[in-house]
């Protein structure tokens, strides 16, 4: 009756502060427009990192945002978050909404814990 979104439990960001993961949702079969929202949970607070609506048949990059980029293929969305720092470590939740045509469905993943380790500064060399 509901819709579930699946995402990996843990992802380690690269040394450049980039983290990618796939968010997969159970498709009703006829969704033409899907909205994907990335939420970051810190304690009881949930903040929106980025969001975009994409057309399923286009299967093109869909997030036009400085923080996130993404591509879609069928009921899978490959999300990439950039510019992460150690303070960005946290639980990132993928929310998927089937916006059109009806019926409207919404599903949320259990979250991906992204670990960000700031690179050590290079020692000065004379």
């Amino acid at each position: 009756k509901g819709m579930h979104a699946a995402q990996p439990a843990v992802v380690l960001a690269s040394s450049r502060g980039v983290a990618s993961f796939v968010c997969e949702y159970g498709s009703s079969g006829n969704a033409a427009e899907v909205r994907v929202t990335m939420l970051r949970q810190a304690g009881s607070q949930m903040t929106e990192v980025c969001a975009a609506t994409y057309t399923v048949e286009d299967e093109l990059a869909f997030l036009d945002d400085s923080t996130c980029t993404g591509t879609s293929s069928g009921n899978k969305v490959n999300l990439t978050i950039q510019g992460l720092r150690a303070m960005g470590t946290g639980l990132y939740i993928c929310k998927v909404e089937l916006m059109y045509p009806p019926p409207y469905y919404v599903g949320m993943g259990n979250g991906t814990q992204i670990y960000v380790i700031d690179p050590e500064p290079c020692p000065d060399s004379d």
Epitope: K1, R35, M99, Y104
Partner: antibody
Framework: EVQLVETGGDLVKPGGSLRLSCVAS????????MNWVRQAPEKGLQLVGG????????YYTDAVKGRFTISRDNAKNTVYLQMNSLRAEDTAVYYC???????WGQGTLVTVSS | QAVLNQPASVSGSLGQRVTISCTGS????????VAWYQQLPGTGPRTLIN???NRASGVPDRFSVSRSGNTATLTISGLQAEDEADYHC???????????FGSGTQLTIL
């Protein structure tokens, strides 16, 4: 703050036409499909139809098919409901709503009577 | 017009608990989600319970929902004066291929 404001409701004779507008603000309008819903006096809500985010696809409930047309202008953050061949049973308050039902407008009254 | 059945009215005293039922069929509530809306006099509906069964943003936890078979129930506990309003349920009907709504229930605070 998200706002949806419907306008254009009026008293019209049977067989007449009317165009309703719904102006949106406070959210990325062009990213959202939109619905129109109506509520006849002392009756429940009824879906009229909807339109996708780009305006290229619409759907309608059987009661209005062929008579009503939904369109949108994303540059103006506005969705429209063109109503033709109006009947007494179309008398209702008409609401626009985002397709995820998160937000609704306050409604505009359409009265069809001779 | 209304496909889902709701009681025309319910009432309760301040602080009390009331329930509003919404009965459908195996092609709507029995097979799909149920959302709930609150409508104050002279205003448009406001979503109380989203289609995933969760409360909409800003809705207090006094509002809760349950479902059994083809019937969904909205429970409002600790009634407050501002809860006096009409309440509507909705679901997707897989036979009619449209959203169906309840007839609406008027809640009166005694």
């Amino acid at each position: 703050e998200v706002q949806l404001v419907e306008t254009g409701g009026d008293l019209v004779k049977p067989g007449g036409s009317l165009r309703l507008s719904c102006v949106a603000s406070g959210f990325s309008f062009s990213s959202y499909a939109m619905n129109w819903v109506r509520q006849a006096p002392e009756k429940g809500l009824q879906l009229v139809g909807g339109i996708n985010s780009g305006g290229s696809s619409t759907y309608y409930t059987d009661a209005v098919k062929g008579r009503f047309t939904i369109s949108r202008d994303n540059a103006k953050n506005t969705v429209y409901l063109q109503m033709n061949s109006l009947r007494a049973e179309d008398t209702a308050v008409y609401y626009c709503a985002i397709s995820n039902w998160a937000y609704w407008g306050q409604g505009t009254l359409v009265t069809v009577s001779s | 017009q209304a496909v889902l059945n709701q009681p025309a009215s319910v009432s309760g005293s301040l602080g009390q608990r009331v329930t509003i039922s919404c009965t459908g069929s195996s092609s709507d509530i029995g097979k799909s989600y149920v959302a709930w809306y609150q409508q104050l006099p002279g205003t448009g509906p406001r979503t109380l319970i989203n289609v995933d069964g969760n409360r909409a943003s800003g809705v207090p936890d006094r509002f809760s929902v349950s479902r059994s078979g083809n019937t969904a129930t909205l429970t409002i506990s600790g009634l407050q004066a501002e809860d006096e309003a009409d309440y509507h349920c909705s679901s997707w009907d897989w036979s009619l291929h449209t959203y169906v709504f309840g007839s609406g229930t008027q809640l009166t605070i005694l």
